[in-house]
Amino acid sequence: LEIKVNPPQDFEILDPGLLGYLYLQWKPPVVIEKFKGCTLEYELKYRNVDSDSWKTIITRNLIYKDGFDLNKGIEGKIRTHLSEHCTNGSEVQSPWIEASYGISDEGSLETKIQDMKCIYYNWQYLVCSWKPGKTVYSDTNYTMFFWYEGLDHALQCADYLQHDEKNVGCKLSNLDSSDYKDFFICVNGSSKLEPIRSSYTVFQLQNIVKPLPPEFLHISVENSIDIRMKWSTPGGPIPPRCYTYEIVIREDDISWESATDKNDMKLKRRANESEDLCFFVRCKVNIYCADDGIWSEWSEEECWEGYTGPDSK
């Protein structure tokens, strides 16, 4: 006799208004009396519609939450698994049931903002900027909302960057406990003459940090051969172990690059008679503290002019 189990009921993908953080939820299947005491597991698969691969979750819960790109539609499917001790060791699964979440097509794509860029400056404040849609009326203005886990609901930007009295960016500070988790942004717009398409962005703040440049550069030469270059990590909340550095060294007309995770570097002069020796440095958050980052601006250049007399450095 073939054992059968029903799929879950009322599978749906819900948007609680958190800018891309969606709820996938369902109800238990109708289970025949024989299997009432059995443990049910659910195999959930979901993806953005343009994705090649499904994310797969096995759970006993009746809800699963995750972040999605709301610029694209979402599809999911789910089936019931009966635990093997209820089925004499055989694997029993229900058919799949499917659900989808369609994106709003309100407003043409040309009305959506362009070139959204966000930088988390020195791990302290976030600046996002955008350009207006390609074809919008002059009365169009944009509004930015954001959410991350820990906030009760999506918040609107309170400090807009403006150009010609239009919002073209937003500055956010005091983002408590907002790193190492998805940060969701929606920029929507309004015009009396046409609907405006919303734009969604999701990232993690630690991956878009742009530190301040290193400071207090110092160069010393021992035995007229051994060079030691030192610099200080910039001030702010980023600990020294989170930095990686790129150094450009110039000896007379020759220059070369080097890299280190430390805030000093030793090397030998290429030529004893070199007249001047200079270096400058920039930094970025390293692989210990983020998956990615943005290089700081270059520091000021520091030079050692070489020993040419008692008045020299």
Partner: nanobody, 115 residues
Framework: QVQLQESGGGLVQPGGSLRLSCAAS????????MGWYRQAPGKQRERVAG???????VYAASVEGRFTISRDNAKNTGYLQMNNLKPEDTAVYYC?????????WGQGTQVTVSS
């Protein structure tokens, strides 16, 4: 208290392979990067490979193409696959798990490459 334990070191002939493991006693892998360092007698400790929490990797020029770093967050374990080993790879190998809040080092495992 989080502890890191390296294993997999030993004596191997030139051209041989070893796989080092670094097991963490606590759940510190999720948001932290992980690196393998080595220190040969009389030399400074150097990083040979690193991997971010999301899987981005960096390698020292001397091991590029021969060593592969990987991680299994579910097992709180990192790995260093070392192929085509050379005598100059002889050193004590240490693993490090670090992040904005954390910085932990293992006790080290000896790797000796000799015929």
């Amino acid at each position: 208290q989080v502890q890191l334990q390296e294993s997999g070191g030993g004596l191997v002939q030139p051209g041989g392979s070893l796989r080092l493991s670094c097991a963490a006693s606590g759940s510190i892998f999720n948001t932290n990067g992980m690196g393998w360092y080595r220190q040969a007698p009389g030399k400074q400790r150097e990083r040979v490979a690193g991997i971010s929490s999301g899987g981005n990797t960096v390698y020292a020029a001397s091991v590029e193409g021969r060593f592969t770093i990987s991680r299994d967050n579910a097992k709180n374990t990192g790995y260093l696959q070392m192929n085509n080993l050379k005598p100059e790879d002889t050193a004590v190998y240490y693993c490090r798990v670090a992040g904005r809040q954390d910085d932990y080092w293992g006790q080290g495992t000896q790797v000796t490459v000799s015929s």
